[in-house]
């Protein structure tokens, strides 16, 4: 009886694992083995595929074969008993194109209201992704173990921190990798769960903002308690993509070590042009807070997007706000040659209920105010281009009292 060729050969490549699966064409014939040959592009001869010779099952692994993953190859398979079947040729393929990204490795660390996630590729020193190691981005799904309501976080790098969690709560997450340059989305890691710690006595500093004054950067933050000392650290933002890099070390800003106020001032020349991350920590001498949320600090943007200056004309029932260009040292106005929008926040001095107005124009009327009432106003500029999406810090608040009734002219 003639042996039939095997059919329906599938090539599965996950990271550096090359697996072949196929169907027997004749289940009734026992003791059949299967063998594969491969052929590289531009070659006439077929070579025996090591790891896939005289296989009794319908699966084999040819990961040990050192292939150029960007080069097209062709496979063929035949069945063998006393005689052999004809060869069945598999459509040629390029390993890199066919490859899937495997599940990444995930390591979690818990804080009281945050989880630090360390992500690394599932296959160390992968040949398949050797040229793309730094191009991986990751996405994750996280949920409270008790509720199961999922939140998705896209486009993160190999070190990521999720904030605003609840203390003493178990969270579960799974992570997958993507190579957006090659339109490849990987498979999810196993689910990892971790319980956040008991709430820390000292909360982390909040609302960190950087502004420019003269030739200095001014870093400000909010803190709940008085009589604290603070330290500020920085890191090159690109290192988030590559935490294996030996340079991945947070560094102190010399003028911001053990400061007693909720701000510190340091010269602009501390940082060369670039994008940095900044974080702040509080201490009372005995206890230390966790680090604040990291803020991104772009020296280029910081230098060019300054808070607007404005003045207020007060009437009985309204404010007229006139927004001008920000001033540099020497009181010269800064020329900002890209379209801006202005966010104007105001509130009644006796209340903390803020209102927000967004305008492109530089003269804004805030109507329907109460006479003889103190209102406070602050403003900041945003680039109109949503892709650039940059913002200045807020100007200092200016407070004014509305006039008595009937002065609306």
């Amino acid at each position: 009886k003639n042996l039939k060729s095997p059919q329906k050969v599938e090539v599965d490549i996950i990271d550096d694992n090359f697996i072949l699966r196929w169907n027997r064409s004749d289940e009734s014939v026992g003791n059949v083995t299967f063998s594969f040959d491969y052929q590289k592009t531009g070659m006439d001869n077929w070579i025996k595929l090591s790891g896939c010779q005289n296989i009794t099952s319908t699966k084999c692994n040819f990961s040990s074969l050192k292939l150029n993953v960007y080069e097209e190859i062709k496979l063929r398979i035949r069945a063998e008993k006393e005689n052999t079947s004809s060869w069945y040729e598999v459509d040629s393929f390029t390993p890199f194109r066919k490859a899937q990204i495997g599940p990444p490795e995930v390591h979690l660390e818990a804080e009281d209201k945050a989880i630090v996630i360390h992500i690394s590729p599932g296959t160390k020193d992968s040949v398949m992704w050797a040229l793309d190691g730094l191009s991986f981005t990751y996405s994750l799904v996280i949920w409270k173990n008790s509720s199961g309501v999922e939140e998705r976080i896209e486009n993160i790098y190999s070190r990521h921190k999720i904030y605003k969690l609840s203390p003493e709560t178990t969270y579960c997450l799974k992570v997958k990798a993507a190579l957006l340059t090659s339109w490849k989305i990987g498979v999810y890691s196993p689910v990892h769960c971790i319980k956040t710690t008991v709430e820390n006595e000292l909360p982390p500093p909040e609302n960190i903002e950087v502004s420019v004054q003269n030739q200095n950067y001014v870093l400000k933050w909010d803190y709940t308690y008085a009589n604290m000392t603070f330290q500020v650290q920085w890191l090159h933002a690109f290192l988030k993509r590559n935490p294996g890099n030996h340079l991945y070390k947070w560094k102190q800003i010399p003028d911001c070590e053990n400061v007693k106020t909720t701000q510190c001032v340091f010269p602009q020349n501390v940082f060369q042009k670039g994008i940095y991350l900044l974080r702040v920590q509080a201490s009372d001498g005995n206890n230390t807070s966790f680090w604040s949320e990291e803020i991104k600090f772009d020296t280029e943007i910081q230098a060019f997007l300054l808070p607007p200056v404005f003045n207020i004309r007060s009437l009985s029932d309204s404010f007229h706000i006139y927004i001008g260009a920000p001033k540099q040292s020497g009181n010269t106005p800064v020329i900002q040659d890209y379209p801006l929008i202005y966010e104007i926040i105001f509130w009644e001095n006796t209340s903390n209920a803020e209102r927000k107005i967004i305008e492109k124009k530089t003269d804004v009327t805030v109507p329907n105010l109460k006479p003889l009432t103190v209102y406070c106003v602050k403003a900041r500029a945003h680039t109109m281009d949503e892709k650039l999406n940059k913002s200045s810090v807020f100007s200092d608040a200016v407070c004014e009292k509305t006039k008595p009734g009937n002065t609306s002219k």
């Epitope: 009644e348 927000k356 967004i358 492109k360 945003h382």
Partner: nanobody, 128 residues
């Protein structure tokens, strides 16, 4: 603060209609111009702008996927914005959110997304 209350969501057969309402209640004072709009979101996807209207100019914006089927309108006296949805399709199934920005000069889906106050949402389900 600004509070938004959506209503009018529900289940409907493909080809049917629904009218969503969003009432904007602002304590302390009212700004003369608002930009109000509707977004929708399905699980795991980003919120997408559906329609927006400027109370100052009456100018409107529509996403390509709803043009000719959805109409946004306003009742300034009631500080309410409506979304009339006709010829509904299964792919219109989503949570619909109302958003408002206090602005007379900047009324786009981007403005609402970046700076808007948001409502809690109302579910719209269209079955085939």
């Amino acid at each position: 603060q600004v509070q938004l209350q959506e209503s009018g969501g529900g289940s409907v057969q493909a080809g049917g209609s629904l009218r969503l309402s969003c009432a904007c209640e602002a304590s302390r004072y009212t700004y003369s111009s608002n930009c109000m709009g509707w977004f929708r979101q399905t699980p795991g996807k980003e919120r997408e702008g559906v329609a927006a209207i400027s109370t100052a100019s009456g100018s409107t914006y529509y996403a390509d996927s709803v043009k000719g089927r959805f109409t946004i309108s306003q009742d300034n006296a009631k500080n309410t914005v409506y979304l009339q949805m006709n010829s509904l399709k299964p792919e219109d199934t989503a949570m619909y959110y109302c958003a408002v920005v206090e602005s007379s000069t900047y009324c786009t889906p981007d403005a609402l997304k970046r700076f808007g106050y948001w409502g809690q949402g109302t579910q719209v389900t269209v079955s085939s």
